[in-house]
């Protein structure tokens, strides 16, 4: 019957396992008159046969490694051998079996690595080949370190990328390798096919000898540079050296300063390029980078520290044009009137900023001069000779000389003589009762007005009232602002109220003056008042520990890898359930109990990085309130995209016949990340047979020129295959085709007679 093994002539594809002796026919084609026989052409390799009656079969075992696809054509012929149907393509796909073992290209590898090399940066590749199909487990290779000799404290210093065979240092290796202690290591590496996952996998081993070399790429000692240097600039201050000659050095200013006064030359010598000012910036931290000829970093940057040493280049400055203090008329000798605090921009706690205070003039000198003294180093003014009388002299002006070791500055102080402070503030109410507020009451809200009065001289420190909460608010959730004209106190919320930690607070206020009370007068119960704050519960949403959570992983991490985690707490203490929102690519899942985030699909940096999703924390039980935070997953690039043409190049043509060899320029790109220097592709012809007619030459890292080698081309389309290699780790290669048509031209354009094929080239060379 027609069906799986027989039927009419039509394009078909058959899959046959290699290595199996023929056990049945492939297909029986049925002839429709006038067809009487069949003919087989194409890649038969004398294996595939069609009998005249249409029976297609193969006569011996196939070998995928010899040919993975046999492209055959079957035609139906009439009695005269003329094709009456077809030819139609018949594709035989040879399915792979694991009949080849992986083999290392070398039985021994040798390499060297510098101490402190970046962990994970490959310094050597081992490479094995397996003739089996790399698209199946049969040809998927898995590299492993079998043993490291010597092994110190059971710590692996080396690691291997099990897919690429790239050998690099582990974090411990980067930190601990020391050629003085151990200059060489030996690794035994195995490679298995079947992705290393099967008991039936084939394997091979190789030996790797590694020499550890000294790393002179080290951060120099911190540098001290005196500010305001008058020496000719630039001045060499330190140096860095890469391990090999030819490195290109640069400095990176992480702080993005408007003025960056340092430079580095191509020897690695670092200079300060202009005088520094410690008062502008007292220390600099920047980085020295060594790059290769292509602008790729050779190693991690070195941190350079420059401390700017102070010189005494700043005079003292007064706190304000006039500093005002008050003194009560009956104050006793030695009482503090106030402290004058001058400033000096030079370095703190050094002689350059150490200040001396001296009174140089008192006006008026009534009833005598020298009524005040100032502590030489502290700047505290004291009453020196006698009590003062407001009715005699209500105001004194002092000129005070403030000096450091080189500079002198005059500051002015006004001392107002005021009434004695013999009245205490008295609250108009001793108990302001109860106040009930919800815990989500806004910060800044005024919740209570309090009032005390003081009978002392108005608008002086004796009558001014300051309110303090002295009990019941250890968290500092409340504050009191005073109106200086009315002495009214406004109780405001400074921090969020919290039912869970303080449902009831018994608050005690104290009212006091900035001026001290006269001897014998004390604050009493009249200067105290209380009130009770009752906070009511509001069910609050869970709170995330961060607004944005961020994690960084390589784009090729295995499915199921933990890529980050989030945490939230519920104010009411309820359990929390985590979920994801906006995972548009279906890459992630979250453990709803722990908040750990895992990958569930292959990640792809080229699809967009960082990948942003929202995490939702929801109360379990209660009113199921939820809150949202961001999770940003930064994907680090791996070289997983082969180069391709940057645009569509159909429509290229040369006018036929060529009068002289011609050329055209094309551009390549790929989707991987190209830090620092952009792509660095290399170009070659895709097959040897093209070399008689064409040549390809590189212009730069992204562009190349395709040139004709002669002028003897037929008037037709040529498809030129070009191999583009990205030089990555591992290197990836793309084979692209440039269709170039040689055609008769009219006024510089391709001429096509009417009714000719479509797809006329439109770009002439």
């Amino acid at each position: 019957q027609e069906g799986k093994f027989s039927g009419p002539l039509k394009p078909m594809t058959f899959s046959i396992y290699e290595g199996q002796e023929p056990s049945q026919i492939i297909f029986q084609f049925k002839a429709n008159p006038p067809a009487v026989t069949f003919e087989l052409t194409g890649e038969t390799d004398n294996i595939f046969v069609i009998e005249r009656e249409g029976l297609l079969y193969y006569n011996r075992a196939l070998d995928r490694e010899t040919r993975s696809t046999h492209n055959l054509q079957v035609a139906a012929l009439d009695a005269n051998g003329i094709i009456v149907e077809g030819p139609v393509p018949i594709t035989i796909k040879v399915k792979d079996i694991n009949d080849n073992r992986p083999t290392f290209l070398q039985s021994k590898y040798e390499g060297s690595v510098r101490q402190n090399s970046r962990p994970g940066k490959p310094f050597l590749y081992v490479n094995a080949t397996d003739l089996d199909d790399p698209a199946t487990p049969n040809g998927q290779l898995y590299y492993q370190i079998v043993i490291q000799l010597p092994m110190i404290n059971n710590v692996m210093y080396f690691q291997i990328n099990n897919k690429t065979g790239a050998i690099s240092l582990t974090r411990e290796g980067s930190q601990e390798l020391n050629p003085a202690k151990n200059p060489s290591y030996n690794l035994v590496i195995s490679v298995k096919d079947m992705g290393g996952q099967s008991e039936n996998s084939f394997s091979d081993t190789t030996s790797v000898d590694i020499i550890v070399t000294e790393n002179i790429w080290k951060a120099p000692k911190p540098v001290e540079m005196v500010e305001n240097s008058t020496d000719p600039h630039p001045i060499k201050i330190t140096q860095v050296r890469w391990n090999d000659p030819g490195a290109q050095y640069s400095l990176v200013d992480k702080e993005k300063l408007p003025r960056f006064p340092f430079s580095i030359d191509q020897e690695g010598d670092i200079y300060v390029t202009q005088p520094l000012d410690r008062e502008e910036k007292d220390a600099y931290v920047f980085y020295a980078v060594a790059k290769d000829e292509y602008g790729k970093p050779l190693s991690y940057p070195l941190e350079i520290h420059v401390k700017v040493k102070d010189i005494n280049d700043n005079p003292p400055t007064c706190p304000s044009p006039v500093t005002v203090f008050e003194v009560q008329e009956n104050e006793r000798l030695g009482n503090s009137i106030g402290t004058l605090t001058a400033h000096d921009r030079d370095e703190e706690n050094t002689a350059n900023s150490f200040l001396n205070y001296r009174i140089v003039e008192q006006t008026p000198k009534l009833p005598m001069d020298g009524l005040f003294l100032i502590q030489t180093y502290a700047g505290m003014l004291q009453l020196a000779k006698q009590s003062l009388k407001k009715q005699d002299t209500p105001q004194y002006n002092l000129t005070i000389e403030v000096s450091d070791k080189d500079f002198k500055t005059l500051c002015f102080v006004q001392i107002n003589v005021i009434d004695i402070n013999d009245q205490i503030p008295i609250f108009e109410k001793s108990d302001y009762g109860n106040l009930t507020l919800a815990e989500d009451t806004n910060i800044g809200s005024t919740i209570l007005t309090i009032q005390a009065t003081d009978a002392d001289e108005p608008f002086t420190g004796s009558s001014k009232i300051l309110y303090h909460i002295i009990k019941g608010d250890s968290e500092g959730r409340l504050g009191v602002d005073t109106d200086p004209h009315t002495n009214t106190g406004y109780v405001i919320i400074k921090k969020p109220l919290d039912f869970e930690t303080a449902a009831v607070s018994n608050i005690v206020f104290k009212a006091e003056n900035p001026e001290p009370l006269v001897f014998g007068v004390k604050y009493n119960a009249s200067s105290f008042a209380k009130f009770t704050l009752i906070v009511t519960d509001v069910n609050e949403a869970p709170q995330f520990s961060q607004h944005v959570f961020q994690a960084k992983v390589s784009e090729d991490v295995a499915i199921g890898t933990k890529v980050g985690n989030v945490t939230a707490k519920d104010p009411e203490g309820l359990d929390i359930s985590y979920s994801l929102r906006g995972d548009t690519r279906g890459w992630l899942k979250i453990d709803h109990v722990t908040g750990e985030i895992f990958s569930v699909a292959p990640l792809d940096r080229e699809a967009g990085s960082p990948y942003r999703v929202q995490v939702v924390a929801t109360e379990v039980g209660g009113s199921s309130l939820s809150s949202v935070s961001e999770f940003h997953l930064i994907l680090m690039d791996v070289n997983d995209n082969p180069p391709r043409l940057a645009k569509d190049y159909t429509g290229l043509f040369f006018c036929h016949p060529l009068s002289a060899p011609g050329s055209l320029i094309f551009e390549a790109t790929d989707d991987d990340q190209h830090l620092f220097r952009g792509p660095h592709f290399t170009f070659s012809l895709g097959s040897g047979s093209l070399q008689n007619d064409w040549e390809v030459s590189k212009i730069n890292g992204t562009h190349a020129r395709l040139s004709t080698r002669h002028t003897e081309f037929e008037e037709r389309e040529y498809v030129v295959l070009i191999r583009i290699n990205d030089g990555g780790r591992p290197p990836l290669e793309g084979i692209v085709s440039l269709p170039v048509t040689f055609c008769s031209c009219v006024e510089g354009s391709c001429f096509r007679p009417a009714g000719h094929q479509t797809g006329i080239p439109t770009v002439g060379m």
Partner: antibody, heavy 119, light 112 residues
Framework: QVLLQQSDAELVKPGASVKISCKAS????????IHWVKQRPEQGLEWIGY????????KYNEKFKGKATLTADKSSSTAYMQLNSLTSEDSAVYFC????????????WGQGTSVTVSS | DIVMTQAAPSVPVTPGESVSISCTSS???????????LYWFLQRPGQSPQLLIY???NLASGVPDRFSGSGSGTAFTLRISRVEAEDVGVYYC?????????FGSGTKLEIK
């Protein structure tokens, strides 16, 4: 051995018809196509068409459609060609020919039948 | 229709010498199976045509190996080395690639 025996010469008047035969022997008649070829005096060869007795498949050169009619009688292993509305242009020797089984070449030929159209 | 051209109506030759007869086609007779569908026939005076060469270069059974065929997809040559008297007649090329089959106009071999 393979033999193709054609009928004798014919003298016919303009406007008339003639039917010439080609009797096959020495092989299975239905297995092979029979071709007919025309040769005018002192001129080249022209392919008229073929008949495949197994299927009854017939293919004509467009130039001879309406002029020649090909038939076959499997019982007598004979192929026929009838020529209609004869004119002096149809005066020629007509050959039948058989293809080889695999290489599809006219290896076997009849001796030819001369047709003369004259009033 | 494919046009077969035999440019030389006749070629004179001395017995024992070699001679080449050419034929061209208006379309390539090379098919994707690698075969070139070109045949050579000899028609001796008063006889039916006789097959000499099939598929451009293959000698038909019973034909002396003095005859050989060669060519590309569109230009073909029949070569006779050491011509004998019995080789006289008209030589025709014919294409067998597609319908209608077509013959060349013939080249007459004459003995000097």
């Amino acid at each position: 051995q393979v033999l193709l025996q054609q009928s004798d010469a014919e003298l016919v008047k303009p406007g008339a018809s003639v039917k010439i035969s080609c009797k096959a022997s020495g092989y299975t008649f239905t297995d092979h196509a029979i071709h007919w070829v025309k040769q005018r005096p002192e001129q080249g060869l022209e392919w008229i068409g073929y008949i495949y007795p197994e299927h009854g498949t017939i293919k004509y050169n467009e130039k001879f459609k309406g002029k020649a009619t090909l038939t076959a009688d499997k019982s007598s292993s004979t192929a026929y060609m009838q020529l209609n509305s004869l004119t002096s242009e149809d005066s020629a020797v007509y050959f039948c020919s058989r293809l080889t089984n695999y290489f599809y070449v006219m290896e076997y030929w009849g001796q030819g039948t001369s047709v003369t159209v004259s009033s | 229709d494919i046009v077969m051209t035999q440019a030389a109506p006749s070629v004179p030759v001395t017995p024992g010498e070699s001679v080449s007869i050419s034929c061209t086609s208006s379309k390539s007779l090379l098919r994707s199976n690698g075969n070139t569908y070109l045949y050579w026939f000899l028609q001796r005076p008063g006889q039916s045509p006789q097959l000499l060469i099939y598929r451009m270069s293959n000698l038909a059974s019973g034909v002396p190996d003095r005859f050989s065929g060669s060519g590309s997809g569109t230009a073909f040559t029949l070569r006779i080395s050491r011509v004998e008297a019995e080789d006289v007649g008209v030589y025709y090329c014919m294409q067998h690639l597609e319908y209608p089959f077509t013959f060349g106009s013939g080249t007459k071999l004459e003995i000097k």
